[in-house]
């Protein structure tokens, strides 16, 4: 009876349910390629429910394996303006801690406005994210766009 | 010992793990720009565990955060044909209740053939999914090629 | 408390999460279109969980709906390039047991030099899935841009 | 609602050229291809083409490549035909139509254009 | 080019009675859950008129006595009950690929 009782009093957090969903706030200064992140349900539908941004990068809190996905949409372009400022491309990886940097997911615009994908990785807690945007058009703002998250699967 | 039978015995239901993949059953009249949907095992690989259909737009069961998917391909469609037609879009959005309207997610085709996306948002029970297919070109039917889904995440 | 102490211990393959992310290991002969994948921590960040691989195709261990998602970018791929060698077609597919045979998901490359999807769908142990990748670009072995993968969603 | 007004009939001499208009109304302009068709008795109905008012691009029936320019101009909402080098085989009804949602069949026709070709 | 091929070239039908129009094409015009056949209707002295589209599907406007069916290479309107104002040339085309083409026309008379 007392595990029952424990079970129910558990935060949703313990059982493992990471998850956040972030909308684009701004682009870097001129030598940063990094997209900034903002997340909040005053923001819209945008959530952080474990996951926390740090500086506009998404540090995980939790070790797992994570679903990641992002969609990135081009403002104001077409595909003529998307292969006369060729090539855009949007990288996704750990950025911190050093000792653990990498790229998880790549993606290239070419004839393109919008790129989106997903994959399965492992994070450790301390892992942030980054997504470096490397081309000459900004990213849309609009929240059906652009947004980028994480979804905590299994240990 | 009582606990654990009736752990045992909670439909999947239950445990929140609302679930739908759908099948494009056809477009809409003429000012009509969504896209309706079916599903079941009886039309091939797809389903609704809990979300229902309303007149072909997906209504939501259960509040929570839901990872939602969609993939559309059009027809007899090459980038030539898809440049030489008026911009292709497609948006999914909350259409009802009214007051909860907002789009969700949103690509547009440029010169592809195919789009494909998803997002984590919260839903919540009794919100109305639209597609809404803006454009000239038709969408293909084929169940590999254009397919729409949700699946809940956590509360 | 004997029911609480053997939900505890538990393996995590029994509460029905299998997952599993590959990377690209080789594409087949001449008249052979499958991709063939592997998977490990000694490769990097692919792994498998519960699912297994079959001559570099992965075969299902658990019945269940499943999150099937896909990237897959042509190497030395530019718009020109896919232009000139289209069709290239990426299809997700059960090969085998020949009896439950059927594509599940099909994309084209069109002008674009990267595809990425996800679906859900119902999967029963012994299903092998087979990734048929027509044309004649090859695809990055870039564990950032090419990477298959499935995870459990629910029985 | 949709309506496409053709120009008057056309009188020519083997060798001309003609170009005939279609002025379309009731819609967005440049959010529907519009198609030309040819109708003779002795070939019946023939797709010559099909113009993309949004960026000018036409697409062409092979039969008619060498001798068909299909334009349209957005700030008249009128798209035009033209044809060179007739024969008396030109001497046919020219209709331009367009859909009501996908393209690929016609829903809105114009009155057609008549084109008689004669020394 | 997909050739289409509509018969009979010419029917008599009584008031009242069923018309059967059949068009063949050449090789299939289906493809992505579609059958890419459409049917007009064209009276003297006016453009062709839009009865069917996609094989099957009425348009906006047109009776329900008017039908089709088919897939594949071949296809059929059907007009029941056929009335006075259905005499007129039927014509058959297909948006399968470039360049669309269509059938030689049957003519249909009321008896």
């Known amino acids: 009876q007392r595990f029952a009782q424990a079970q129910q009093q558990l935060p949703l957090e313990s059982l493992g349910w990471d998850v956040a969903e972030l909308q684009l706030n701004h682009t870097g200064p001129q030598q940063d390629p990094r997209l900034y992140w903002q997340g909040g349900p005053a923001l819209g539908r945008s959530f952080l429910h474990g996951p926390e941004l740090d500086k506009g990068q998404l540090r995980i809190h939790r070790d797992g394996i994570y679903m990641v996905h992002i969609q990135v949409t081009l403002a104001i372009c077409s595909s003529t303006t998307a292969s006369r400022h060729h090539p855009t491309t949007l990288a996704v990886g750990i950025c911190s801690p050093a000792s653990r940097s990498i790229s998880l997911l790549r993606l290239s615009f070419h004839q393109g406005c919008t790129i989106a994908s997903q994959r399965l990785t492992p994070l450790a807690r301390g892992d942030t994210l980054c997504t470096n945007l490397t081309g000459t058009l900004l990213p849309s703002r609009n929240t059906d766009e652009t947004f980028f998250g994480v979804q905590w699967v299994r240990p | 010992q009582r606990f654990a039978q009736a752990q045992q015995q909670l439909p999947l239901e239950s445990l929140g793990w609302d679930v739908a993949e759908l099948q494009l059953n056809h477009t809409g009249p003429q000012q009509d720009p969504r896209l309706y949907w079916q599903g079941g095992p009886a039309l091939g690989r797809s389903f609704l565990h809990g979300p229902e259909l309303d007149k072909g737009q997906l209504r939501i069961h259960r509040d929570g955060i839901y990872m939602v998917h969609i993939q559309v391909t059009l027809a007899i469609c090459s980038s030539t044909t898809a440049s030489r037609h008026h911009p292709t879009t497609l948006a999914v959005g909350i259409c009802s209740p009214a007051s909860r309207s907002i789009s969700l997610l949103r690509l547009s085709f440029h010169q592809g053939c195919t789009i494909a996306s998803q997002r984590l948002t919260p839903l919540a029970r009794g919100d109305t999914l639209c597609t809404n297919l803006t454009g000239t070109l038709l969408p293909s039917r084929n169940t590999d090629e254009t397919f729409f889904g949700v699946q809940w995440v956590r509360p | 408390q004997r029911f609480a102490q053997a939900q505890q211990q538990l393996p995590l393959e029994s509460l029905g999460w299998d997952v599993a992310e590959l990377q690209l290991n080789h594409t087949g002969p001449q008249q052979d279109p499958r991709l063939y994948w592997q998977g490990g921590p000694a490769l990097g960040r692919s792994f498998l969980h519960g699912p297994e691989l079959d001559k570099g195709q992965l075969r299902i261990h658990r019945d269940g709906i499943y999150m099937v998602h896909i990237q897959v970018t042509l190497a030395i791929c530019s718009s020109t390039t896919a232009s000139r060698h289209h069709p290239t077609t990426l299809a997700v597919g059960i090969c085998s047991p020949a009896s439950r045979s059927i594509s599940l998901l099909r994309l084209s490359f069109h002008q674009g030099c990267t595809i990425a999807s996800q679906r859900l769908t119902p999967l029963a142990r012994g299903d092998t899935l087979c990734t048929n990748l027509t044309g004649t670009l090859l695809p990055s072995r870039n564990t950032d841009e090419t990477f298959f993968g499935v995870q459990w969603v629910r029985p | 609602q949709v309506q496409m007004q053709q120009s008057g009939a056309e009188l020519v001499k083997p060798g001309a050229s003609v170009m005939m208009s279609c002025k379309a109304s009731g819609y967005t302009f440049t959010t529907y291809n519009i198609h030309w068709i040819k109708q003779t008795p002795g070939q019946g109905l023939e797709w010559i083409g099909d113009i993309y008012p949004g960026n000018g691009d036409a697409s062409y029936n092979q039969k008619f490549r060498d001798r068909a320019t299909l334009t349209a101009d957005r700030s008249s909402s009128t798209a035009y035909l033209q044809l060179s080098s007739l024969t008396s085989e030109d001497s046919a009804i020219y209709y331009c139509a367009t859909f009501s949602r996908f393209d690929g069949w016609f829903a809105y026709w114009g009155q057609g254009t008549l084109v008689t070709v004669s020394a | 080019d997909i050739v289409m091929s509509q018969s009979p070239a010419s029917l008599a039908v009584s008031l009242g009675q069923r018309a059967t129009i059949s068009c063949r094409a050449s090789?299939?015009?289906?493809?992505?859950?579609?059958?890419?056949m459409h049917w007009y209707q064209q009276k003297p002295g006016q453009p062709p008129k839009l009865l069917i589209y996609?094989?099957?599907n009425l348009e906006s406007g047109v009776p329900a006595r008017f039908s089709g069916s088919g897939s594949g290479t071949n296809f059929t309107l059907n007009i029941h009950p056929v009335e006075e104002e259905d005499a007129a040339t039927y014509y058959c085309q297909h948006s399968r690929e470039l360049p669309y083409t269509f059938g030689g026309g049957t003519k249909l008379e009321i008896k």
């Open positions: 090789r299939s015009v289906s493809t992505s859950g579609y059958s890419y």
């Open positions: 996609l094989a099957s």
